[in-house]
């Protein structure tokens, strides 16, 4: 049965998933999908990493931790009730049937109090993404917008604005973890 995680409407949800790379920088492809883990890969993919980088992601889904050290926990920004359900974290360890699959159940609760409206930075506008797609017609790389001028301080500030650190800290120790090598 799936491990259950909770978040309130409007919060960022945190779904923990970890592995220990065999050596620093020796990364393993990981995918996150909405729905239980199927036989191969992930269904309804929301985010992927390869041996080097995040190579596909969709709006509101991102990795907050240091995925180069094996923290592939998923953050879902500004959740709604529709985000409830099972999510698959799949760590695609090379070899014969070596994949590690974790099904995590996200339960979204209505917000207790409607907060006063606050101006939020648009994360996806600040980070237009390059989607490297597999087998998706002749144009296999789609560039959505161009990267704006943005410095490391801005990136760090933006990440801090979007991070729900209390929830992350609470759940980190209960996440799915696998050691490789």
């Amino acid at each position: 049965s799936e491990v259950e995680y909770r978040a309130e409407v409007g919060q960022n949800a945190y779904l923990p998933c970890f592995y220990t790379p065999a050596a620093p920088g020796n990364l393993v492809p990981v995918c996150w999908g909405k729905g239980a883990c199927p036989v191969f890969e992930c269904g309804n993919v929301v985010l992927r990493t390869d041996e080097r980088d995040v190579n596909y992601w969709t709006s509101r889904y991102w990795l907050n931790g240091d995925f180069r050290k094996g923290d592939v926990s998923l953050t879902i920004e500004n959740v709604t009730l529709a985000d409830s359900g099972i999510y698959c974290c799949r760590i695609q360890i090379p070899g014969i049937m070596n994949d590690e699959k974790f099904n995590l159940k996200l339960v979204i609760k209505p917000a207790k109090v409607t907060p006063a409206p606050t101006r939020q930075r648009d994360f996806t506008a600040a980070f237009p993404r390059m989607l490297t797609t597999r087998g998706h017609g002749p144009a296999e790389t789609q560039t959505l917008g161009s990267l704006p001028d943005i410095n490391l301080t801005q990136i760090s500030t933006l990440a801090n604005e979007l991070r729900d650190s209390r929830l992350a800290n609470d759940l980190r120790d209960s996440g799915a973890t696998i050691r490789i090598g």
């Epitope: 199927p38 036989v39 695609q92 090379p94 049937m97 087998g135």
Partner: antibody, heavy 123, light 107 residues
Amino acid sequence: EVQLVESGGGLVKPGGSLRLSCAASGFTFSDYYMTWVRQAPGKGLEWVASINYDGRNTYYLDSLKSRFTISRDNAKNILYLQMNSLRAEDTAVYYCARGYYYYGSSPNYFDYWGQGTLVTVSS
Amino acid sequence: DIQMTQSPSSLSASVGDRVTITCRASENIYSYLTWYQQKPGKSPKLLVYNAKTLAEGVPSRFSGSGSGTQFSLTISSLQPEDFANYYCQQHYGTPLTFGQGTKLEIK
């Protein structure tokens, strides 16, 4: 046009070996999971093995993984199935199939199939 | 292993009939179900994936439904070219498994 053409089938004695090939064309081979499925005469379909894009991850029917090896050569656009210690019950038409894929889905079903190659194991 | 049971194993029908083939999984497979059509001497053809999504180029008279353990493939008005064998396949659990097939024949 997507094409998958199997070869390498034939008559082999029990205990013998065969290597099947599947030549792919009309698509970017290295972007797709590939799979072998077999069908014994007059019977249904049975999954045999699958391999991921770069060949680093392989998946087998448990009862076959000690005797069968799936591999691929992305430079040549060829999928292979090495079959050792063949038995009469391995007699079947062997199909190679492409795992359906687009960037938000998973390759767990097969959108193109080859015509199949018949493997007969008999003394 | 997840067992897939199709019914009926064979079915006689006429052109224009509405027919439904069912597939039952031995455990919950969510919507991870595919339907294929296979004509004698030919390779299988993808019809429906994820239980209800019609594959490209498949006529709209075909439809899939169901989730969990119970699934069905419906052909709303049979055409002569639809007489064939039909297989369901689950892609939730390893190994991938197929139903035993349903033979759709002309009455």
